[in-house]
């Protein structure tokens, strides 16, 4: 999906009022030193993208976010934001989230919530220059 | 059973307020669209706005901004259309319509509809 | 955003086939794949019986269908019956500030 036509101050507006309270709340009990960021991303567009595959694609030890409440928050925001969004993605995604088993907060994933945390933090910050 | 069910007929008059509720069973509240349409007497339907209670996201028609608030309570699976500064145009028949899981513009389970009258 | 362009009845006997055109522009049902036919009863709350173009809900008859082609989108009904008597509406997404327009409505009359 590309995400070039996203209203992206409507999902930077959900993300702070909503989405990033459920992040932190995933991320309880873990340092914010604990993990190093390794996922970056260059502009508002690439960013979404990588939030997308990082928060709905099953990874090795992390297979189970797309059931989260930040990750269902995640799919409304994009549904209502991005047109087209729904019919390229949902679908795909719900296929997925039928196929996984029960909620397992692993160390892998909770890394991988941590990446998702900064890719949101440099979405919010599209001006700044790429580290 | 999954149904909305909406409060009862109104009788208003010019300049006041009406609050209209829906009230939803048998699905998960705030993962929907909520909308709200209504339909004059021997008129077409007409969107007035959307409240996704999952992200508290609100949408109003542009002819409408500014007069209408819709709200939603998930604690219990209702959702409210307030229409301000009514006029006699502004009798209707008003719908709730659940959109439908992520495609919020497709309305699947209608209520059964109130008549709000504004009149002098 | 002007409402979608339907004509005001369409008729057709029992066994026969209707369509009805809904008209719109590249801001609504040419710009998206995103219409939807809704079937109202007299005193009824409307129906959804056609979504994103071409799909019917579970409990639709298949004799219910939809197509689009560039700004006008159509509902085809085929093998008409007594019951398929009532007003159809239109809809089409229109952006992210406008999720349903709707058409005029049209009484399709089952003679």
């Known amino acids: 999906y590309d995400f070039t036509n996203c209203d992206f101050e409507k999902i930077k507006a959900a993300y702070l009022s909503t989405i990033s309270k459920d992040l932190i709340t995933y991320m309880s009990g873990t340092k914010s030193t604990e993990f190093n960021n390794t996922v970056s991303c260059s502009n508002r567009p690439h960013c979404l993208t990588e939030i997308q595959s990082l928060t709905f694609n099953p990874t090795a030890g992390c297979a189970s976010l797309a059931k989260e409440m930040f990750a269902m928050k995640t799919k409304a925001a994009l549904a209502i934001w991005c047109p087209g969004y729904s019919e390229t993605q949902i679908n795909a995604t719900q296929a997925m989230k039928k196929a996984r088993k029960s909620k397992v907060t692993t160390n892998k994933c909770l890394e991988q919530v941590s990446q998702l945390q900064g890719l949101w933090r440099r979405f919010n910050r599209p001006l700044l220059k790429q580290q | 059973q999954v149904q909305l069910v909406q409060s009862g007929a109104e009788v208003k008059k010019p300049g006041s307020s009406v609050k209209v509720s829906c009230k939803a069973s048998?699905?998960?509240?705030?993962?929907?669209?909520i909308n709200w349409v209504r339909q004059a007497p021997g008129q077409g339907l007409e969107w007035l706005g959307v409240?996704?209670?999952?992200?508290?996201?609100?949408i109003y028609a542009e002819k409408f901004q500014g007069r209408v608030t819709i709200t939603a309570d998930t604690s219990t699976s209702t959702a409210y259309m307030e229409l301000s500064s009514l006029r006699s145009e502004d009798t209707a028949v008003y719908y709730c319509?659940?959109?439908?899981?992520?495609?919020?513009?497709?309305?699947?389970?209608w209520g059964q509809g109130t008549l709000v009258t504004v009149s002098s | 955003q002007s409402a979608l362009t339907q004509p005001p009845s369409a008729s057709g006997s029992p066994g026969q086939s209707v369509t009805i055109s809904c008209t719109g522009t590249?801001?609504?049902?040419?710009?998206?794949?995103?219409v939807s036919w809704y079937q109202q009863h007299p005193g009824k709350a409307p129906k959804l019986m056609i979504y994103?173009?071409?799909k019917r809900p579970s409990g639709v008859p298949d004799r219910f269908s939809g197509s689009k082609s560039g700004n006008t989108a159509s509902l085809t009904v085929s093998g008409l019956q007594a019951e398929d008597e009532a007003d159809y509406y239109c809809?089409?997404?229109?952006?992210?500030?406008?999720?349903?327009?709707f058409g005029g409505g049209t009484k399709l009359t089952v003679l």
């Open positions: 048998g699905f998960t509240f705030g993962s929907y669209g």
């Open positions: 590249t801001s609504d049902i040419g710009g998206y794949n995103r």
């Open positions: 409240i996704v209670p999952l992200v508290g996201v609100t």
């Open positions: 319509a659940r959109g439908q899981e992520y495609f919020y513009w497709y309305f699947d389970l």
């Open positions: 994103e173009v071409s």
């Open positions: 809809s089409s997404y229109a952006g992210t500030d406008t999720f349903a327009i």
